[in-house]
């Protein structure tokens, strides 16, 4: 059922989520800046075709439009999306020593955000019985592919987070 901003979600949960989204956005921006500065990979739009051939997926948030938001479906898609990005970030491991610490922090922050969403789903009795299984992740055959993959994953994640932020902010409005 569609649900407007006056939802059953606690304000403390929504504020925590907004904090976490902004933390991850900062991590993602730092990764993008380092990929640009170190490897001159600055424009994700130039790598779209490579992204298709590498099989880097997008996470949908189709249950989250503010006009017809389905709470259970939206939270589930948020969690599934974060779960997907955990796998994509894991596939980037070993991208380069310079990027390692930034990627490590991003990975953990995404996992912690997924935990926050799951906790709330559990409290509302909406949590799926089992964790979704991780789908096939892209295999990067070269250092360049992994770095280009890093640019695309970071770009996809930022887009996902922008939508997430808008949805959460809409829900947080009194």
């Amino acid at each position: 059922t569609p649900l407007g901003p006056a939802s059953s979600l606690p304000q403390s949960f929504l504020l925590k989520c907004l904090e976490q989204v902004r933390k991850i956005q900062g991590d993602g921006a730092a990764l993008q800046e380092k990929l640009c500065a170190t490897y001159k990979l600055c424009h994700p739009e130039e790598l779209v075709l490579l992204g298709h051939s590498l099989g880097i997926p997008w996470a949908p948030l189709s249950s989250c439009p503010s006009q017809a938001l389905q709470l259970a479906g939206c939270l589930s898609q948020l969690h599934s999306g974060l779960f997907l990005y955990q796998g994509l970030l894991q596939a980037l491991e070993g991208i380069s020593p310079e990027l390692g610490p930034t990627l490590d922090t991003l990975q953990l922050d995404v996992a912690d955000f997924a935990t926050t969403i799951w906790q709330q789903m559990e409290e509302l009795g909406m949590a799926p019985a089992l964790q979704p299984t991780q789908g096939a992740m892209p295999a990067f055959a070269s250092a360049f592919q992994r770095r280009a993959g890093g640019v695309l994953v970071a770009s996809h994640l930022q887009s996902f987070l922008e939508v997430s932020y808008r949805v959460l902010r809409h829900l947080a409005q009194p």
Epitope: K16, E19, Q20, R22, K23, G26, F83, Q86, G87, Q90, P101, D104, T105, Q107, L108, A111, D112, F113, A114, T115, T116, W118, Q119, E122, A127, Q131, Q134
Partner: antibody, heavy 119, light 112 residues
Framework: QVHLVQSGAEVKKPGASVKVSCKAS????????MHWIKQAPGQGLEWIGY????????NYNQKFRDKATLTADKSTSTAYMELSSLRSEDTAVYYC????????????WGQGTLVTVSS | DIVMTQSPLSLPVTPGEPASISCRSS???????????LYWYLQKPGQSPQLLIY???NLASGVPDRFSSSGSGTDFTLKISRVEAEDVGVYYC?????????FGQGTKLEIK
């Protein structure tokens, strides 16, 4: 309520390995990361790394990358830390602590496991 | 890695008196989201550490309000308004802004 119960004290010879367990109860185990922290005798706390049981991903403090291996068994809600090529400086109490964000981070700790390395 | 430095390392206090512990980080822990990723833990004798303060100034569940914490991006202070016997132990500041998480050396609070 949340409980983290660690395996008992171990005495090992230099060069040996040891595997410490941390059994979790009172929450959905795969959803939270599990962190490991070292405390050498009379010393402070050092973060070793964490395991994300949902995807089996482990991340390590560079200092412990060749020392510790973190794993998790979702079926038994247990996290493990294996320490290899033990030396006297590995003698310490090792803690597991549940991860999370905000007031959830390290809000729950195991009781600690003393690993003594002695010839 | 972010280095956390505490002072003093030892703090003898008379019960009922205030106490103050300082912590300094080698990098600002204030994120652009407005949150300062600074935590305080207390390890009582013979026990595991326990969470006292999260995100610089928030009291963890069950922590008495005689504890408070404040600071800037790099300089932080934990205050106990009136020390009680049960407050003895080692206090650690820690950062979780970025990996690896790091802790201060610890401040041992003891009763005079």
């Amino acid at each position: 309520q949340v409980h983290l119960v660690q395996s008992g004290a171990e005495v090992k010879k230099p060069g040996a390995s040891v595997k410490v367990s941390c059994k979790a109860s009172g929450y959905t185990f795969p959803i939270y990361t599990m962190h490991w922290i070292k405390q050498a005798p009379g010393q402070g706390l050092e973060w070793i790394g964490y395991i994300n049981p949902s995807i089996g991903y482990a991340n390590y403090n560079q200092k412990f990358r060749d020392k510790a291996t973190l794993t998790a068994d979702k079926s038994t809600s247990t996290a493990y830390m294996e320490l290899s090529s033990l030396r006297s400086e590995d003698t310490a109490v090792y803690y597991c602590a549940r991860g999370g964000y905000g007031d959830s981070l390290f809000a729950y700790w195991g009781q600690g496991t003393l690993v003594t390395v002695s010839s | 890695d972010i280095v956390m430095t505490q002072s003093p390392l030892s703090l003898p206090v008379t019960p009922g008196e205030p106490a103050s512990i300082s912590c300094r980080s080698s990098k600002s822990l204030l994120h652009s989201n407005g949150i300062t990723y600074l935590y305080w833990y207390l390890q009582k004798p013979g026990q595991s550490p326990q969470l006292l303060i999260y995100q610089m100034s928030n009291l963890a569940s069950g922590v008495p309000d005689r504890f408070s914490s404040s600071g800037s991006g790099t300089d932080f202070t934990l205050k106990i308004s009136r020390v009680e016997a049960e407050d003895v132990g080692v206090y650690y500041c820690a950062q979780n802004l970025e990996l690896p998480y790091t802790f201060g050396q610890g401040t041992k609070l003891e009763i005079k």
